[in-house]
């Protein structure tokens, strides 16, 4: 950190690395819910015109798609993954990549993916393919 | 030798406007995704603008969102920070920073350089 930029105690805006540069946030779509036309297909963009900088440092980008009886929505946010979102940990955060892996809801078709490059919720991956063969 | 020098910081009503520049030297200025940072006392770090090296492809918090507008002008060298409708807790010092280029953006990176910060204060 440059000396004339304080540290303030037990604060998590400022995260360095291991030579003390300051780490700068990601960039995440975030629209909150939204309804989405998202359906069977192997990929999907989020049509979220908002991109906002994520409040902390450590939060990855995040992307939730739930399909019920009634409609189809698409939730883009920002997320500290050592915290849960909707009660699952976001054990793929490190990704470069929005793969979509489903979760037990009852009720309703539920998938959630997180990632870690600019606007990486943009385009959410439902496709197989993804999850074994794709070096990137 | 990098530098980063801001200005354009006051004393401003609340409601009022400033606009922040921070003159850049010593680097490749279209090279380089630019931020705003900004520091409000005793606090931590808050990231409030960015815009992309070419294209002027624009990203803000929520905090600012609709009221300040980040701009560059490359033949310059130079970059902006229009702030409109300010507000008690838009007062902080305020720092333009450079980010590191790579490949693609990540969460890797980090910023490199500061400059020395210009105070805004937003009071009555």
């Known amino acids: 950190i440059p000396p004339h930029v304080q540290k303030s105690v037990n604060n998590d805006m400022i995260v360095t690395d291991n030579n003390g540069a300051v780490k700068f946030p990601q960039l995440c779509k975030f629209c909150d819910v939204r309804f989405s036309t998202c359906d069977n297909q192997k990929s999907c963009m989020s049509n979220c015109s908002i991109t906002s900088i994520c409040e902390k440092p450590q939060e990855v980008c995040v992307a939730v798609w739930r399909k019920n009886d009634e409609n189809i929505t698409l939730e883009t946010v920002c997320h500290d993954p050592k915290l849960p979102y909707h009660d699952f940990i976001l054990e793929d955060a490190a990704s470069p990549k929005c793969i979509m892996k489903e979760k037990k809801k009852p009720g309703e078709t539920f998938f959630m993916c997180s990632c870690s490059s600019d606007e990486c919720n943009d385009n959410i991956i439902f496709s197989e393919e993804y999850n074994t063969s794709n070096p990137d | 030798e990098v530098q980063l020098l801001e200005s354009g910081g006051g004393l401003v009503q609340p409601g009022g406007s400033l606009r922040l520049s921070c003159a850049a030297s010593?680097?490749?200025?279209?090279?380089?995704r630019m931020w705003w940072v900004r520091q409000a006392p005793g606090k931590g770090l808050e990231w409030v603008s960015a815009i992309e090296p070419i294209g002027n492809r624009t990203y803000y918090a929520k905090s600012v969102f609709g009221r300040f507008t980040i701009s560059r002008d490359n033949s310059k060298n130079t970059l902006y920070l229009q702030m409109n409708s300010l507000r008690a807790e838009d007062t902080a010092v305020y720092y333009c920073?450079?980010?590191?280029?790579?490949?693609?953006?990540?969460?890797?990176?980090?910023?490199?350089?500061w400059g020395q910060g210009t105070l805004v204060t937003v009071s009555s």
């Open positions: 920073a450079k980010q590191i280029p790579g490949r693609k953006w990540t969460a890797n990176s980090r910023f490199d350089y």
């Open positions: 010593g680097f490749t200025f279209t090279e380089y």
